[in-house]
C-alpha cells in the first residue's frame, strides 16, 4: 500500500502507482494541480478498503478517466482542487 502523508511542502505523495484500479474498489479520487507549495500534480485515490494510493498522473488508465471526467464536466468551470465520488 502506497503512503500518503502531509509535509510542510504540502506534497502528499511519497510513491506513485500506475496500476489500474477497478471502479468498484474506488471511493473517491482527488486531483491536486501543481502549486500550493507542491511542484507537481498529485492524484490521490481513496479506496473502499480504506487504503489510499497516489497515482502517477501519466498513468494511461487515470488519464483516460480524467478525460472522461473532463468531458462530463465541460459545462462547469474548472476548480483547482476537487474530489470526485466514483459511483
Amino acid at each position: 500500500v502506497l503512503e500518503v502523508y502531509y509535509t510542510h511542502l504540502r506534497c502528499r505523495c511519497v510513491q506513485e502507482s500506475s496500476v489500474f484500479i477497478p471502479r468498484r474498489f474506488i471511493d473517491r479520487i482527488q486531483i491536486s494541480p501543481r502549486g500550493n507549495g507542491c511542484p507537481r500534480k498529485e492524484i490521490i485515490v481513496w479506496k473502499k478498503n480504506k487504503s489510499v494510493v497516489c497515482v502517477d498522473p501519466q498513468a494511461e488508465w487515470i488519464q483516460r478517466i480524467m478525460e472522461m471526467l473532463r468531458k462530463k464536466s465541460s459545462s462547469t468551470p474548472p476548480v483547482p482542487v476537487f474530489k470526485r465520488k466514483i459511483p
Epitope: V19, F20, P22, F25, K48, R64
Partner: antibody
Framework: EVQLVESGGGLVQPGGSLRLSCAAS????????MSWVRQAPGKGLEWVAE????????NYAPSLKDRFTISRDNAKNSLYLQMNSLRAEDTAVYYC?????????????WGQGTTVTVSS | DIQMTQSPSSLSASVGDRVTITCKAS??????VAWYQQKPGKAPKLLIY???YRYTGVPSRFSGSGSGTDFTFTISSLQPEDIATYYC?????????FGGGTKLEIK
C-alpha cells in the same frame, strides 16, 4: 505460504443442491475480496461470483445469480458457494480465488479446485 | 456484459519462437485486463495484470500491452515449460469475463 483449499464437490442429481467451501490460510482473509470461478470439462474459465470482505457487496454472473449464493465467514477464514437447482451444465471444476484490491486488482491466488458432477 | 474475444484458439510453435495472442473487448475496459496461464489439471496462474505489468516471479519473456479494447500477450522466446492454455480476463467491471483461451503446443 498462501493456501486456498476447496472442498464439498461431488456427484449430485439434477435439481439437487451442494455447498462448496474454500478454506484460506497464509493470508489475512478478512481483508480481501474473494471469487468463485468454474471450468466445465474441456472448456474455458467462467467467473461465478465475488464477495467483498464485509459481505456488503456481492456480484454474480447474471445467468447464475438466481441459483447460486456466495458467502463467507471471516472468523473461520472460509468462503462458501451454495448451489441450488443444479443442472448438467453446472458440471465443472470450481475454483476459489483471491481478488486482490490492494496492489494487483486481479485474481492472484487460486485454490486447486473441487469437482462438481451433476448427473442422474 | 463485456465479451472478451481471444485469438487464436490454438497455436503451434517451436521452442525459441515469438508467440503473440490477442484479446479484443466488446467495449472499453481501460487497462483492466489480466492474463493467466493454466496447465492441464492445475489452477490458473496470474501472469500479467493491468494489461502490461508482470506479476511477481513471472519471467521477463512474458509481456502484455494494450488499452481500451485491444490487448496483446507475448512470449518473446517460447520455452518447453510454457506449454499451457492462456486466458485473458477483463476486471474493469462486473460480471468479470474471460476470453475463450489459447491452447499453446510445441511443434
Amino acid at each position: 505460504e498462501v493456501q486456498l483449499v476447496e472442498s464439498g464437490g461431488g456427484l449430485v442429481q439434477p435439481g439437487g443442491s451442494l455447498r462448496l467451501s474454500c478454506a484460506a490460510s497464509g493470508i489475512d482473509f478478512s481483508r480481501y475480496w474473494m471469487s468463485w470461478v468454474r471450468q466445465a470439462p474441456g472448456k474455458g474459465l467462467e467467473w461465478v461470483a465475488e464477495i467483498n470482505p464485509e459481505s456488503s457487496t456481492i456480484n454474480y454472473a447474471p445467468s447464475l445469480k438466481d441459483r447460486f449464493t456466495i458467502s463467507r465467514d471471516n472468523a473461520k477464514n472460509s468462503l462458501y458457494l451454495q448451489m441450488n437447482s443444479l443442472r448438467a451444465e453446472d458440471t465443472a471444476v470450481y475454483y476459489c480465488a483471491r481478488q486482490d484490491d490492494y496492489e494487483y486488482y486481479a485474481m492472484d491466488y487460486w485454490g486447486q479446485g473441487t469437482t462438481v458432477t451433476v448427473s442422474s | 456484459d463485456i465479451q472478451m474475444t481471444q485469438s487464436p484458439s490454438s497455436l503451434s510453435a517451436s521452442v525459441g519462437d515469438r508467440v503473440t495472442i490477442t484479446c479484443k473487448a466488446s467495449q472499453d475496459v481501460n487497462t483492466g485486463v489480466a492474463w493467466y496461464q493454466q496447465k492441464p489439471g492445475k489452477a490458473p496462474k496470474l501472469l500479467i495484470y493491468s494489461a502490461s505489468y508482470r506479476y511477481t516471479g513471472v519471467p521477463s519473456r512474458f509481456s502484455g500491452s494494450g488499452s481500451g479494447t485491444d490487448f496483446t500477450f507475448t512470449i518473446s522466446s517460447l520455452q518447453p515449460e510454457d506449454i499451457a492454455t492462456y486466458y485473458c480476463q477483463q476486471y474493469y467491471s462486473t460480471p468479470l469475463t474471460f476470453g475463450g483461451g489459447t491452447k499453446l503446443e510445441i511443434k
